[in-house]
């Protein structure tokens, strides 16, 4: 049951993940201007990965995408691999971990392949997270040195009475939600991850466990018990039957109630 | 065609008040922002206010902050201007303009007359 | 605050010549996110309000006489009459439409000579 909570809670959050890194990556506010030096600019300039925008005083917003490749900072084009490159594993996990989830039955799937369609997808959303992650904070840090670089030249032509203020950008909301939807889309990875450990079955669930009958011993192998009741509760080489079941290691040492008639 | 009428001028005694209306006609005026100009008697134009298209910002300039008000009821197509604690140099001739690209005042009204004396 | 300098105050000009007013600002008008300057022309006539000639310093608003033309950048503004029509007897004003508190020039009163 711990199992299925941790795998579903895992899947919605790196669903809710995943939204979050899509909506960063379409978002026009990365960049905000800086409203420090004038908070009431009659004129509000932000910037996406894709366009850049101006939104006036008197209402009217103006959008322009970026429309060359060759000219844009390599900066800003890494950004963009690692956002893109992080959605795409994340739907591929999205995908994956559908099928994966216990709740959902698909034909004869044994548990083995579900915990390891479950850890596929827990791997593809933790780095999908760290592609976000990484891809927010680059950008950041490149306002963060550009924001100084522009206040060391703040005013340029000050030698008359005619200033020219450089525009300074600050951090956009897009970056907040990407640094929390890269967030919440590693913490579904990690707990897709711990699901999967739950999920998969043990090696060799029983060894051959042997009966001894006055006349006769034969051997059974109650190895397919766990999978055939449907439960996942034995997990561990427990013995089944105490009323004369004994590992063939014990035999010699406990004397059945069956070998003396 | 467009239409800004301005209402509410008239003589008002220092320290007095008056609201000033413009109503708006033949254009979306929820979607545009809102501008008061005066222009003192064979003087220039100076800007008064601005308040945003939904009202939630409101910019003055330093000579009439804390003592007017403007705000808008949309639902109305009008426009306001509440004025406080009026003085002398207030009498001017008030229009009201509508806001458009390049934050341009496209849109103007005829203009009310407002005279500030004892 | 920004202050915009016009000039000259008074200019006279023969009808059909070209008419050049000139308006400085105290600091840029250009917005680097849209390499656009935001200064305004206005036209006021005797008697009637103010009328928006042009925006963003060289957009004609519509219905606006191709004979009106707004050029300059940054700081150094220019309005041009082409061909100097009896009804363009006014006063011109330019505006800063870049930035609180919006600021107009002294104007410019424009008579035929």
């Known amino acids: 049951m711990a199992v299925t909570a941790c795998q579903g809670l895992g899947f919605v959050v790196s669903l809710i993940g995943i939204a979050g890194i899509i909506a960063a990556t379409c978002m026009d506010q990365w960049s905000t201007q800086d409203l420090y030096n004038n908070p009431v600019t009659a004129v509000f300039n932000y910037q996406g990965l894709w366009r850049s925008c101006v939104r006036e005083s008197s209402g009217f917003t103006e959008c322009r995408g970026y429309f060359t490749l060759l000219g844009l900072p390599a900066m800003l084009q890494a950004v963009r691999a690692l956002m893109i490159v992080g959605i795409v594993l994340g739907a591929i996990g999205l995908l994956v971990s559908i099928f994966a989830l216990k709740c959902i039955r698909i034909g004869s799937m044994e548990d083995s392949a579900k915990a390891n369609m479950t850890l596929t997808s827990g791997i593809m959303f933790i780095v999908s997270g760290l592609c976000a992650i990484a891809g927010v904070s680059v950008f950041a840090n490149m306002l963060v040195t550009n924001f100084w670089m522009s206040t060391a030249n703040m005013y340029t032509g000050m030698g008359g009475m005619v200033q020219t203020v450089q525009t300074r950008y600050t951090f956009g909301a897009a970056l907040f939600v990407g640094w929390v939807a890269g967030g919440l889309t590693l913490i579904g990875g990690v707990m897709m991850c711990i699901a999967c450990r739950g999920l998969a079955p043990e090696e060799t669930n029983y060894k051959a466990v042997s009966y001894h009958a006055s006349g006769h011993s034969v051997a059974y192998k109650p190895g397919g018990f766990k999978a055939s009741t449907g439960f996942g509760s034995n997990t561990k080489n427990k013995k089944i039957y105490d009323g004369g079941a004994r590992t063939e290691d014990e035999v010699q040492s406990y004397p059945s109630k069956h070998d003396y008639v | 065609e467009v239409q800004l009428l301005e209402s509410g001028g008239g003589l008002v005694q220092p320290g007095g008040s008056l609201r000033l209306s413009c109503a708006a006609s033949?254009?979306?005026?929820?979607?545009?922002?809102m501008s008061w100009v005066r222009q003192a008697p064979g003087k220039g134009l100076e800007w008064v206010a601005t308040?945003?298209?939904?009202?939630?910002?409101?910019y003055y300039p330093d000579s009439v902050k804390g003592r007017f008000t403007i705000s808008r009821d949309n639902a109305k197509n009008t426009l306001y201007l509440q004025m406080n604690s009026l003085r002398a140099e207030d009498t001017a001739v008030y229009y009201c303009?509508?806001?458009?690209?390049?934050?341009?005042?496209?849109?103007w009204g005829q203009g009310t007359l407002v005279t500030v004396s004892s | 605050d920004i202050v915009m300098t016009q000039s000259p105050d008074s200019l006279a000009v023969s009808l059909g010549e070209r008419a050049t007013i000139n308006c400085k600002s105290s600091?840029?008008?250009?917005?680097?996110?849209?390499?656009?300057?935001?200064l305004t022309w206005y036209q006021q006539k005797p008697g009637q309000p103010p009328k928006l000639l042009i925006y963003?310093?060289?957009t004609r608003e519509s219905g606006v006489p191709d004979r009106f033309s707004g050029s300059g950048s940054g700081t150094d503004f220019t309005l041009t009459i082409s061909s100097l029509q009896a009804e363009d007897v006014a006063v011109y004003y330019c505006?800063?439409?870049?930035?609180?508190?919006?600021?107009f020039g002294g104007g410019t009163k424009l008579e035929i000579k």
């Open positions: 303009a509508g806001l458009g690209r390049g934050n341009a005042m496209e849109y």
């Open positions: 033949e254009f979306t005026f929820s979607n545009y922002a």
């Open positions: 308040i945003s298209s939904g009202r939630s910002s409101t």
């Open positions: 600091q840029s008008l250009l917005n680097s996110g849209n390499q656009k300057n935001y």
């Open positions: 963003w310093a060289s």
């Open positions: 505006q800063n439409a870049y930035s609180y508190p919006f600021t």
